[in-house]
Interface confidence: low
């Protein structure tokens, strides 16, 4: 997260760290007791490593009573996700067992109505992604509030030049932005999961290259079918 600040510890009990061989790779969001939603491209970076999900964490390194690392029973990328596009960049991870819920571990309600968030709405994005262009990684969860950007502006030739589909949304990126390592994490508007950080190799913090988020409401049928 660029231009953000440290989050209040455990105030986002839905927040997950998707890890490979014990290292943070991507963000994720607990959407059901045994399921974490993340970005499909995160798996590409996992190679053949052991994928696990850390729940209940604020610090990645420090011992915390609520922290628990879960093995992944099943990884379900969206069937139409492809390495060469950010379309359908969603991944569902089934934990090896139901998560132990508590004040620091709780699923987040996700948007089911396929209607855009009003441009200008302030939404919260959080993650353990890099906090500087130099690539510095934080140990503790960061967050930032970002205004939703209308799709027409986001699709301008100077911005994302028509690449933003109806199944994506944009948020402003003027110095405050999600970045590498935040992919798969939640964009939360009004207490509801609206978007998932896409995992493209986009430049961060440049206002001409807004943050791109996959709109979960556009995938309600798929999410329901996997979770069923």
């Amino acid at each position: 997260i660029l231009g953000g600040r440290e989050a209040e510890a455990h105030a986002r009990p839905y927040m997950a760290s998707v890890q490979v061989n014990g290292e943070h790779l991507c963000g994720g969001v607990l959407v059901a007791e045994q399921w974490v939603l993340s970005a499909a491209h995160c798996l590409e970076d996992a190679a053949d490593g052991k994928v696990q999900v850390l729940l209940g964490a604020h610090s990645l390194s420090q011992p915390e009573p609520s922290k628990r690392l879960y093995d992944v029973l099943r990884a379900v990328p969206h069937p139409d996700s492809r390495p060469d596009t950010i379309d359908h960049d969603l991944l569902l991870l089934q934990l090896s067992e139901k998560a132990t819920l508590g004040p620091a571990v709780r699923p987040l309600p996700w948007q089911r109505v396929d209607r855009d968030v009003e441009p200008g709405t302030l939404c919260d994005v959080a993650g353990w992604g890099i906090v500087s262009h130099a690539g510095r990684r934080p140990d503790r969860l960061q967050h930032v509030l970002l205004p939703v950007l209308d799709r027409a502006t986001c699709n301008r030739r100077t911005h994302h030049d028509g690449a933003i589909t109806q199944r994506m949304m944009c948020a402003e990126s003027n110095r405050r932005d999600s970045c590498k390592g935040d992919s798969g994490g939640p964009l939360v508007c009004g207490g509801v999961l609206e978007g998932v950080v896409t995992s493209g190799s986009r430049v961060c913090g440049n206002r001409k290259k807004p943050g791109i988020y996959t709109r979960v409401a556009s995938y309600a049928a798929w999410i329901d079918s996997v979770l069923a």
């Epitope: 139409d80 596009t85 379309d87 028509g162 589909t165 109806q166 995938y219 049928a221 798929w222």
Partner: antibody, heavy 122, light 107 residues
Framework: EVQLQQSGPELVKPGASVKISCKAS????????MNWVKHSPEKSLEWIGD????????TYNQKFKARATLTVDKSSSTAYMQLKSLTSEDSAVYYC???????????????WGQGTLVTVSA | DIVMTQSHKFMSTSVGDRVSITCKAS??????VAWYQQKPGQSPKLLIF???TRHTGVPDRFTGSGSGTDYTLTISSVQAEDLALYYC?????????FGGGTKLEIK
């Protein structure tokens, strides 16, 4: 003026494939998803899937996923739908149609091609 | 998949009459419903979206209403050129699905 010009009628044998084209003009081809819709008297209108012309990303209705392939040629602003392993149940009019946005939400199909009649018969 | 049901396959009306075409969704689609008109030999034409918003150029005699699972397209004063098939469609979630259609016939 937005126009979607589809290829002509096709008479094909069972088990064969058909590839229909849809040439777009009057708007930025990469700005809107291109959808394909099947229209048959028995099943009314059925959405086959869509393609994002900007990236080539596709979404299919599960019912058609195994047999339909959607592609685009950006250089000629043309979308294609190939349907394979045809049976008599595939005899129908096939439309291409662009998505419509209002307030940045997808809200339906605003512009339609004239339709391509596909007849599957031995 | 969400099933959209138009219970009346045919409706008969006279010029100047008010007519209502109904559509029922198999689950709550949160007002994400569009209506199309298809005249003989033509492609479908978008009339209404988000239940009640008229598309550009659609006459104001066409109005839409509804919520939850039940939706209605009303033509306040039917004209001869309104003879057509009318389809509802949910734009709540993929796969986008349509009703079976209601054919409006002029007496």
């Amino acid at each position: 003026e937005v126009q979607l010009q589809q290829s002509g009628p096709e008479l094909v044998k069972p088990g064969a494939s058909v590839k229909i084209s849809c040439k777009a003009s009057g708007y930025s081809f990469t700005a809107y998803y291109m959808n394909w819709v099947k229209h048959s008297p028995e099943k009314s209108l059925e959405w086959i899937g869509d393609i994002n012309p900007s990236t080539g990303g596709t979404t299919y209705n599960q019912k058609f996923k195994a047999r339909a392939t959607l592609t685009v040629d950006k250089s000629s602003s043309t979308a294609y739908m190939q349907l394979k392993s045809l049976t008599s149940e595939d005899s129908a009019v096939y439309y291409c149609a662009t998505t419509y946005y209002s307030g940045n939400s997808y809200v339906g199909f605003a512009y339609w091609g004239q339709g391509t009649l596909v007849t599957v018969s031995a | 998949d969400i099933v959209m049901t138009q219970s009346h396959k045919f409706m008969s009306t006279s010029v100047g009459d008010r007519v209502s075409i109904t559509c029922k969704a198999s689950q709550d689609v949160s007002t994400a419903v569009a209506w199309y008109q298809q005249k003989p030999g033509q492609s479908p034409k978008l009339l209404i979206f988000w239940t009640s918003t008229r598309h550009t150029g659609v006459p104001d005699r066409f109005t839409g209403s509804g919520s939850g699972t039940d939706y209605t397209l009303t033509i306040s004063s039917v004209q001869a050129e309104d003879l057509a098939l009318y389809y509802c469609q949910q734009h709540y979630t993929t796969p986008w699905t349509f009703g079976g259609g209601t054919k409006l016939e002029i007496k």
